[in-house]
Interface confidence: low
């Protein structure tokens, strides 16, 4: 047996063998050397590179009682769960004195059923909408041919004849399963089965049908939903008067929106209980038994102004000769918009009514015709917005002003009945 450290003498008495197997195999490579004196550390090389983190064990057995006698050194490299990255040429390496010795090589090869690098994934798609699926497999042995299956039915007549790494699906009208088979000389491996769930298409043309001060009616056009009828549509709305706003298409509004559900058909929903003259943002999604569509973009909408819901308050009207002094306060009831002004009407018992636009003032001096002998003069006041006049106050009689007496104030004890409408609760 070779001994010593002469350049021409290799200390190796056993070289690594060969391993060929399928992925996941566990195997061991072994090399043995006989040296004189202190045993060296055995290193392992793969394709000429030292394996720094090799799972190796080294056993040393002295052949004599003296340290300078010969030693048998055995190193074993364990390969657990064989992968493609483990394949290559393996050698043992030792440093003896000033010389380096390398064993004869052994080879690790991989050969078995195809191995999937990429498999089709579950996903949701809108009805009748194109999409792609991916599948990729490798040997060795090569070549590896793929065969796609839809609902367990092959899409090509033979492996390798149809689509390979990417399958283009022009659209589905029902939820379907897809898988791919990988074929090589060793046999067939089947990928996971991906479920492609068909959801309704995003609704289109979300728009306002009608606007009332406290109510908006919206409608939309549903998208295709395949063989699955729509069960309902969901409308989300958010108050957008906080200055932040929502840009069309932004993913999230400034506050979490809340939700109303609409039976379908009709693809229409009345949103009640809104604020007059207030901006909102709305979006809609429609749902089938398979799940919901994607949301439409946020649509900005705004309720129109309404008329004031009550008359001006605390109207007082006094008369001094040919002049009448009338003043009042803003209505306490909701204005439902921007107050533009007040209208005043006065009328005597036998004289026609006179109508005046006072603007935003809350008092007026009236110049009465004649000598002031008109009897039973009464005054009414109404507030108005861009939407029109609110209710008129009850008629207030003009009272004669006497020196030293405070102007009488007529409290309104009764208001005209409020029209029925949805109140803005939020």
């Amino acid at each position: 047996a070779p001994r010593g450290t002469q350049a021409e003498e290799s200390p190796f008495v056993g070289n690594p063998g060969n391993i060929t197997g399928a992925r996941g195999l566990t195997g061991t490579l072994r090399c043995q050397l006989q040296v004189q004196g202190e045993p060296p550390e055995v290193h392992w090389l793969r394709d000429g590179q030292i394996l720094e983190l090799a799972d190796s064990t080294q056993t040393q057995v002295p052949l004599g009682e003296d340290e300078q006698d010969d030693w048998i050194v055995v190193s074993q490299l364990r390969i657990t769960s064989l992968q493609l990255s483990d394949t290559g040429q393996y050698q043992c390496l030792v440093f003896l004195g000033h010389q380096t010795f390398v064993s004869q090589p052994g080879y690790v090869g991989l050969e078995g059923l195809p191995y999937f690098l990429e498999e089709p994934e579950d996903r949701t798609v809108a009805a009748n909408t194109p999409f792609n699926l991916s599948c990729q497999a490798q040997g060795p042995p090569e070549p590896v041919d793929l065969l796609w299956l839809q609902d367990a039915v092959p899409l090509a007549t033979a492996p390798g004849h149809g689509p390979q790494r990417s399958l283009h699906v022009p659209g589905l009208n029902k939820t379907s399963s897809f898988s791919c088979e990988a074929h090589n000389a060793k046999g067939v491996t089947t990928s996971r089965t991906a479920t492609i769930t068909v959801l309704p298409q995003q609704p289109r043309n979300l728009h306002l049908v009608s606007r009332q001060p406290t109510e908006l009616e919206v409608a939309w056009t549903p998208g295709l939903s395949g063989i699955y009828p729509l069960t309902h549509c969901t409308l989300q709305a958010v108050l957008s008067d906080d200055g932040m706003g929502i840009q069309a298409g932004e993913p999230d509004p400034p506050e979490e929106p809340l939700t109303s559900q609409a039976s379908v058909p009709p693809h229409q929903l009345r949103l009640g209980s809104l604020h007059p003259h207030t901006p909102y943002h709305i979006r809609v999604a429609c749902t089938s038994s398979q799940g919901p569509s994607s949301w439409t973009h946020w649509l900005p909408v705004e309720t129109p102004e309404g008329v004031p819901l009550g008359p001006p308050e605390n109207i007082s009207a006094t008369r001094n000769g040919s002049q009448a002094f009338v003043h009042w306060q803003e209505p306490r009831a909701p204005l439902q918009g921007t107050l533009l002004g007040y209208r005043l009407a006065y009328q005597g018992q036998d004289t026609p009514e006179v109508l005046m636009d006072i603007g935003l003032r809350q008092e007026v001096t009236l110049e009465l015709q004649g000598d002031g002998s008109v009897s039973n003069l009464t005054v009414c006041v109404a507030a108005y917005t861009a939407a029109g006049d609110g209710p008129w106050s009850l008629p207030v009689p003009l009272e004669a002003w006497r020196p030293g007496q405070a102007q009488p104030v007529h409290q309104l004890v009764k208001e005209p009945s409020t029209p029925a409408f949805s109140w803005p609760w939020w």
Epitope: V238, T259, Q261, G272, H275, W425, W426
Partner: antibody, heavy 115, light 107 residues
């Protein structure tokens, strides 16, 4: 953490006045309405008054209209219920509750204060 | 005013039972209805809003349905902590109104 804390309840003679406060933390009044709901001993819930997040509107149950006034100080994040001309039938635990925008529910309530 | 009429006013049930409480509005209130649970000495808790939407953190055994005038709260499998009084409430029109309550007691 969202919290509502009522205070100001107590014993009062018929015809007297009380002012209840509802201090809010964990959210801003700017997009949230506040409502007062009461519950007489052994009875159900009765809505009293509400103030929405925008506008100057205030709303009242017919039974308290003209006697109670709801208001809010956004700088203090506090709502108030001023109760005048109190009657024996106003005896109840008064709760304030938060009203989220565009929903039909009160999602956070205070612990209540007894009047 | 819109009246909300709840039925029954009380019921006895056992743990695991399916319980249904109904609420009828005197006029159409769309889906502007909420359901609350209240235990003695405590503030009400929101369970369902907008007729059918489960409020965050509420167990999925609670569900709501209905629109227009007829609404239902269902507890699919009654648990010991569910014995309480339940109220419906409409917010479609002023004044806001509650049902008279349904007390769920242990049989």
């Amino acid at each position: 953490e969202v919290q509502l804390v009522e205070s100001g309840g107590g014993l009062v003679q018929p015809g007297g006045s009380l002012r209840l406060s509802c201090a809010a933390s964990g959210f801003s009044f700017t997009s949230i309405g506040i409502h007062w709901v009461r519950q007489a001993p052994g009875k159900g819930l009765e809505w009293v008054a509400g103030i929405p997040p925008v506008g100057r509107y205030t709303y009242y149950a017919d039974s308290v209209k003209g006697r109670f006034t709801i208001s809010a100080d956004t700088s203090k994040n506090t709502a108030y219920l001023q109760m005048n001309s109190l009657r024996a039938e106003d005896t109840a635990v008064y709760y304030c509750a938060r009203w989220r925008s565009l929903s039909s529910g009160m999602d956070y309530w205070g612990q209540g204060t007894l009047v | 005013d819109i009246q909300m009429t709840q039925s029954p006013s009380s019921l006895s049930a056992s743990v695991g039972d399916r319980v249904t409480i109904t609420c009828r509005a005197s006029q159409d209130v769309s889906t502007a209805v909420a359901w609350y649970q209240q235990k003695p000495g405590k503030a009400p808790k929101l369970l369902i809003y907008s007729a059918s939407f489960l409020y965050s953190g509420v167990p999925s055994r609670f569900s709501g349905s209905g629109s227009g005038t007829d609404f239902t709260l269902t507890i699919s499998s009654l648990q010991p902590e569910d014995f309480a009084t339940y109220y419906c409430q409409q917010s479609y029109m002023s004044p806001l109104t509650f049902g008279q309550g349904t007390k769920v007691e242990i049989k």
